[in-house]
């Protein structure tokens, strides 16, 4: 059962796992949610009746029954983790805490103009978990405007104290706001020989990399595969760090794989969700329950629905006993990973999918692409929407993309002459325009947010957000597309598609079925040569065939330029302007979405 509200002046008795310090009860709840075992917590607020050394303590708790006895206690705030909830969860915390000093290892001290600048510095520093900033009103003259970057083993403060005229806050890496590079490569036959901060068991290097990503101190990792010569180290995932933030030594070793934390890409890559099955593999751990199940998929479902289950091993039924049902062993451990991994015993193992909701919905795998042809099939581009205007009569106006459950990203130039959001309708999950009838359900638009620097498409800033009146329930035919990570600026996308109903303002001919065209990206330098009378800025991206031959008119204004990278689709561009429809195949010019990620997040995450 999902309980989101906090219980004031209430303390849960017993069940303690560990104590951390957090600046608020709300953040304590987030920490509990992300902890592998925490189901409940008790936070102590500052209060004259409480011992100041207990202020800001966040006690993480577990219980076999998923609840604990409640005791009345002033200044105590208790609650439940969001593990029991089905909604999307985020660790992003933009709050600034006034007059609080969050203690940790102060590894960097520098002057900053503002707390915001200090927070940006922390976000763009590989080691930084949180910061404290002494304002210009701080009593000690030499400490004024000093920005202290801090880290700890847990990622949370070691203590929090009251201190006048300082402010503290957390790194915004988990808000997808870091400019740090996103290195997704996994290097085979490589060992990173730096200090280990932790080690866990993992079935493959990908799971190891994901564990590294959500471990607060891990910057890179080395994984020893099941063929590693030293038996005791097989399936061992070593979580590592270094002062420079990069591996100091790389050693060539067969059957080892190494890689980096994906903390700068976590907005657009699954880091919590381990969805694969591991055949002929047994995960060892504390046994929670043994139940009968028809298949390993059914076993995974049982594990996902059991809030304390972290991983499972399924042993298929022997011959025809037990109505063809096998045994499903639901398991857990202190850190969420198996205590040992064994091979050759015939089991099928995997992880709970409960953590998938901690990843962005946009990372969910969609139907395989239909190769060939120009007409799309249902569910092929589930983020594509058709934006209609109802004035003077109803018609398709522009394309757009679902980027959140209340947000559509599109082009600013679509709203020339649109006086009010009331005349707009957003239809999602549509393949053919002919499906749209008077009774077809749609999303009303609450607000049109146009970039305030937008003047005309050709000058850039051709980007707009639509805030919907109601939220989109994600299904196979309507779900979001990931925004590119700022750390992915240097990625060379090779699998890019433009989609739309083929409508451009000048040509009123519109296709009934959603069209698609695979088009290569063109460098801005090359693009500039093709558009000598227009400035192609770094905030634009170009795509199209050098020799023509592809109808770039398939893309609607405002619609997506979608690129697949590492099995995840990213919204790389928004169809903006260009001469792709005429005989002269110039590349199409698209709004370069990665350059607007801050703007998008600022607008969509505004309180």
């Amino acid at each position: 059962e999902c309980v989101t509200q906090l219980l004031k002046d209430t303390c849960f008795e017993g069940g303690d796992i560990t104590t951390v310090f957090t600046p608020s009860a709300k953040y304590c709840q987030v920490v509990c949610t992300y902890h592998p075992r925490c189901l409940l917590f008790t936070f102590t607020a500052e209060s004259p009746s409480e011992d100041p050394t207990r202020w800001f303590t966040c006690v993480l708790k577990d219980s076999v029954t998923e609840t604990l006895p409640r005791v009345n206690r002033t200044a105590a705030i208790s609650g439940y983790s969001f593990k029991q909830c089905s909604h999307q969860i985020s660790a992003c915390n933009k709050d600034i805490y006034v007059d609080l000093d969050m203690k940790g290892i102060n590894y960097n001290s520098s002057v900053a103009k503002s707390a915001q600048e200090c927070q940006e510095r922390c976000t763009d520093d590989v080691h930084c978990h949180f910061f404290t900033y002494a304002t210009r009103q701080f009593p000690s003259l030499e400490h004024r405007n000093i920005c202290l970057l801090k880290h700890t083993q847990t990622g949370t403060p070691t203590r929090i104290t009251k201190l006048d005229k300082v402010v503290s806050g957390f790194s915004l890496k988990s808000c997808a706001l870091s400019n740090l590079a996103c290195i997704r490569d996994i290097f085979p036959n490589t060992v990173f020989a730096d200090s280990n901060i932790d080690s866990v068991m993992a079935p493959d290097a990908f799971v190891c990399g994901r564990i590294c990503t959500h471990h607060p101190g891990c910057l890179f990792f080395t994984f020893f595969s099941q063929e590693w010569p030293k038996e005791s180290q097989r399936n061992l995932c070593l979580l590592k760090t270094s002062e420079s933030g990069l591996p100091s030594t790389r050693i060539k070793k067969s059957k080892a794989l190494s890689g980096f934390s994906l903390q700068s890409c976590r907005h657009s890559i699954p880091v919590f969700c381990h969805s694969s099955f591991y055949h002929d593999t047994d995960f060892l751990g504390e046994e929670l329950d043994i139940v009968a199940a028809k298949s390993h998929e059914a076993c995974q479902k049982l594990c996902t629905n059991a809030v304390r289950c972290q991983f499972f091993t399924y042993t298929p039924a022997q011959a025809s006993c037990n109505e063809g049902k096998g045994k499903c062993y639901l398991k857990l451990s202190s850190n969420g990973s198996p205590t040992k991994i064994l091979h050759g015993r015939g089991g099928i193992s995997g992880y709970t999918l409960r953590l998938c909701k901690m990843d962005n919905e946009c990372t969910t795998k969609i139907k395989p692409r239909i190769v060939g042809g120009t007409a799309s099939v249902r569910g092929e581009w589930p983020w594509q929407v058709t934006l209609h205007t109802t004035s003077p009569t109803q018609r398709h106006l522009c394309g757009g993309s679902i980027i959140g459950n209340q947000w559509i990203l599109t082009a600013a130039h679509c709203f020339y002459g649109v006086e009010s959001p009331k005349i707009l309708r957003v239809y999602s999950g549509i393949l053919n325009q002919s499906e749209i009838k008077e009774d077809t359900s749609f999303f009303g638009v609450q607000e049109i947010i146009i970039h305030d620097q937008y003047k005309m498409a050709e000058s850039g800033y051709d980007i707009a957000l639509l805030k919907l009146e109601t939220t989109v329930n994600y299904t196979d035919s309507q779900r979001p597309i990931c925004l590119p990570s700022k750390g992915d600026r240097n990625v060379i996308y090779t699998d890019c598609w433009v989609t739309g109903w083929g409508y451009r303002k000048l040509r009123d001919k519109i296709q009934n079925t959603l069209q698609k065209a695979k088009i290569p990206l063109v460098t801005n330098e090359e693009c500039q040569k093709r558009y000598r009378g227009h400035k192609i800025t770094h905030k634009m991206i170009c795509a199209g065939y050098r020799e023509g031959g592809k109808d770039a008119c398939k893309g609607d204004s405002g619609g997506p330029l979608s690129c697949k990278h590492n099995e995840v689709w990213h919204l790389v561009g928004i169809t903006s302007w260009g001469e792709g429809c005429a005989q002269r195949e110039r590349p199409g010019v698209y709004t370069n979405v990665v350059e607007y990620v801050d703007w998008i997040l600022e607008k969509t995450q505004a309180v």
């Epitope: 005309m456 050709e458 000058s459 500039q528 040569k529 093709r530 558009y531 000598r532 009378g533 227009h534 400035k535 050098r546 020799e547 023509g548 260009g578 001469e579 005429a582 005989q583 002269r584 195949e585 110039r586």
Partner: antibody, heavy 120, light 107 residues
Framework: QVQLVQSGAEVKKPGASVKVSCKAS????????IEWVRQAPGQGLEWMGV????????NYNENFKDRVTMTRDTSISTAYMELSRLRSDDTAVYYC?????????????WGQGTTVTVSS | DIVMTQSPDSLAVSLGERATINCKAS??????VAWYQQKPGQPPKLLIY???NRYTGVPDRFSGSGSGTDFTLTISSLQAEDVAVYFC?????????FGGGTKLEIK
């Protein structure tokens, strides 16, 4: 009908500057690019640069980059090309032309040309 | 920069005969090739754009062909008023560049 009318002939001394105007009529001035092309006596055509009257964006040929300035005044639908530090080999007929397409392309309408003579 | 090489430099053709002017680009220019006619004391006049499209008001004896790097302007039946200098131009990549011109005369 579309017309581009250029200013009259100029005689200049080496080192001086010349500013040629090009007044457009018969179409929406800000919707098409204005290109400047010159032709030395008995020679071929040489592209000097382009101005986008809508945005004011300019793009110059590397050969002229440090000497040419193109501007426009949208209120009177006029484009200007100024060439500084004139040399004797700048003696030529200077043409303004409109592009056929909004984003560039062939030049479908040309001014009558302005003869600039550089002589000491 | 893309170099447009025109040939021949000059050409004499009898009235009513076919005249052919060639233009070779130093690299592929897709279909972004135009042809102009210039008579003495006048500005150039657009004849053909996108390799083969006749501009408004241009007689149908003028035609363009080619692809990639090799392009041709053909006048199927030469008329007296066709005496002029003809230029090709690529618009594929900035800066746009012109051929050196072909002077067409009557034999």
């Amino acid at each position: 009908q579309v017309q581009l009318v250029q200013s009259g002939a100029e005689v200049k001394k080496p080192g001086a500057s010349v500013k040629v105007s090009c007044k457009a009529s018969g179409y929406t001035f800000t919707n098409y690019l204005i290109e400047w092309v010159r032709q030395a006596p008995g020679q071929g055509l040489e592209w000097m640069g382009v101005i986008n009257p809508g945005s004011g964006y300019t793009n110059y040929n590397e050969n002229f980059k440090d000497r040419v300035t193109m501007t426009r005044d949208t209120s009177i639908s006029t484009a200007y090309m100024e060439l500084s530090r004139l040399r004797s080999d700048d003696t030529a007929v200077y043409y303004c032309a409109r592009t056929y397409g909004k984003y560039g392309g062939a030049m479908d309408f040309w001014g009558q040309g302005t003869t600039v003579t550089v002589s000491s | 920069d893309i170099v447009m090489t025109q040939s021949p430099d000059s050409l004499a053709v009898s009235l009513g005969e076919r005249a052919t002017i060639n233009c070779k680009a130093s690299q592929s220019v897709s279909n972004d090739v135009a042809w102009y006619q210039q008579k003495p004391g006048q500005p150039p006049k657009l004849l053909i754009y996108y390799i083969s499209n006749r501009y408004t008001g241009v007689p149908d004896r003028f035609s363009g062909s080619g692809s990639g790097t090799d392009f041709t302007l053909t006048i199927s039946s030469l008329q007296a008023e066709d005496v002029a200098v003809y230029f090709c131009q690529q618009d594929y990549s900035s800066p746009p560049t012109f051929g050196g011109g072909t002077k067409l005369e009557i034999k």
